[in-house]
């Protein structure tokens, strides 16, 4: 079975950082030349003489960890025999992904006219690891001009409630900007747009007469 070499580095290491090394011995005592095979992301280079492996591009845990490549050790001179080992680079997470909406929320709506202030629930996520506990996002409006019409309140670490502050909304689309902060180190913030449609309803769903063209929705902020 192939020998497996492992190394562990933070995904934000500087380009040119030594991330590991592989060593091989030739029974006849000949020099060995090292090369990489399967570096599909172009992240690594190997010193042909020493077997030291360096990063040559930004690493990204979210693209996949561990990152697996093969190291080929070849005799210099002689019969040029070679052997292949596995090198597994385990990438440790850095908080480098801003929060985002957990799914496509293009279908959010309220039945028009509102008889009382209403609310809806949305969910946030990100692509970073959350060891020992789940994500703890905080939610706030993206502009003070929204405060007269909307209120956002946290339900838990991943979910929040968007509520209307009055019932005077027209039958049209409004886009509500929401800031989501992950509270990480460093804290990252994402600004997301929640499109909310106020529409005439039939049996609890938006009613769109056949052939009705809504035109370009106006952004409400």
């Amino acid at each position: 079975s192939q020998h497996v070499f492992q190394a562990k580095v933070s995904e934000d290491v500087a380009i040119g950082t030594k991330v590991g090394n592989v060593t091989a011995k030739d029974p006849e005592g000949l020099d060995i030349s090292y090369s990489l095979r399967g570096d599909t992301r172009g992240w690594l280079k190997i010193d042909h003489v020493t077997g030291e492996i360096f990063s040559v591009a930004p690493l990204d845990r979210e693209a996949g960890s561990p990152y697996r490549v093969q190291v080929v050790a070849t005799e210099v001179g002689g019969s040029s025999l070679s052997s292949v080992s596995e090198f597994h680079l385990i990438l440790m997470d850095v908080n480098d992904n801003p929060p985002r909406l957990a799914k496509d929320y293009t279908g959010l709506f309220f039945c028009h006219p509102l008889s009382a202030p209403g609310s809806l629930i949305f969910e946030a996520t990100d692509d970073d690891q959350h060891l020992f506990r789940g994500p703890h996002f905080t939610f706030s409006l993206g502009s003070g001009s929204l405060q007269n019409d909307w209120e956002v309140s946290k339900i838990n670490g991943t979910h929040a409630r968007l509520s209307t502050r009055h019932t005077e909304f027209e039958e049209r689309e409004y886009v509500v900007l929401i800031r989501i902060n992950d509270g990480g180190r460093p804290p990252l913030e994402g600004i997301v747009s929640l499109p909310v449609t106020f529409c005439s309803c039939v049996e609890g769903s938006c009613f769109r007469p056949a052939g009705h063209q809504t035109g370009i929705p106006t952004v409400g902020m």
Epitope: S140, S143, G144, S145, Q147, N148, D149, H166, E168, F169, E170, R172, Y174, R179, N181, E189, T218, V219, G220, M221
Partner: antibody, heavy 115, light 108 residues
């Protein structure tokens, strides 16, 4: 009741900076964003930007990016607007305002830029 | 940015008359995002009407607002001497928030 009390008039030389303050009372300071508005002599009102006092996140009118910097001191319930590299066109009355409820404005601070 | 154009620039009327002030918006906005302010010399703007048609606290019922889309109107049914001032419309639909250039209401 809500009160926004601004600092006094300032006279500055071109190239200087000025920092206008807006002391808020009568409500929880971190609850509502603070807005700043410019009114040059005989001109329409111009929105400069807004700041969320809870975390100092700010949105600026593109026209005032690099000119105005909005900050807050939560412990003093005070918002600040600093104007840099002053020119004669910056001569104006500057207002802080709570857009929440639309109706609460400071009394205005006159900034005069003159050599 | 959304541009608000007010007309007329100056309106000369007598006390007791009816005043109609217009605000044209460069892009359609929701009624909930159009507001009117009154400003007198040396004073901060004072909120008159919010969300197109709601009178602010303490504003007499001679002031009313209407409109939708791109055309909005402030009406003062019977002018009182204290109503002569500059009136601004303002939109809160898009950043940056913008104001009209103002209509000066003066005594004829």
């Amino acid at each position: 009741q809500v009160q926004l009390v601004q600092s006094g008039a300032e006279v500055k030389k071109p190239g200087a900076s000025v920092k206008v303050s807006c002391k808020a009372s009568g409500y929880t300071f971190t609850t509502y964003w603070m807005h700043w508005v410019k009114q040059a002599p005989g001109q329409r009102l111009e929105w400069i930007g807004e700041i969320d006092p809870s975390d100092s996140y700010a949105n600026y009118n593109q026209k005032f990016k690099g000119k105005a910097t909005l900050t807050v001191d939560k412990s003093a319930s005070t918002a600040y607007m600093e104007l840099s590299s002053l020119r004669s066109e910056d001569t104006a009355v500057y207002y802080c305002a709570l857009y929440y409820g639309y109706g609460d404005w400071g009394q205005g601070t006159t900034v005069t830029v003159s050599s | 940015e959304i541009v608000l154009t007010q007309s007329p620039g100056t309106l000369s009327l007598s006390p007791g008359e009816r005043a109609t002030l217009s605000c044209s918006v460069s892009a359609s906005i929701s009624r909930i995002h159009l507001h009117w302010y009154q400003q007198k010399p040396g004073q901060a703007p004072r909120l008159l009407i919010y969300r197109t048609r709601n009178r602010a606290s303490g504003i007499p019922d001679r002031f009313s607002g209407s409109g939708s889309g791109t055309d909005f109107t402030l009406t003062i049914s019977r002018l009182e001497p204290e109503d002569f001032a500059v009136y601004y419309c303002q939109q809160g639909s898009n950043l940056p928030l913008t104001f009209g250039q103002g209509t000066r209401l003066e005594i004829k």
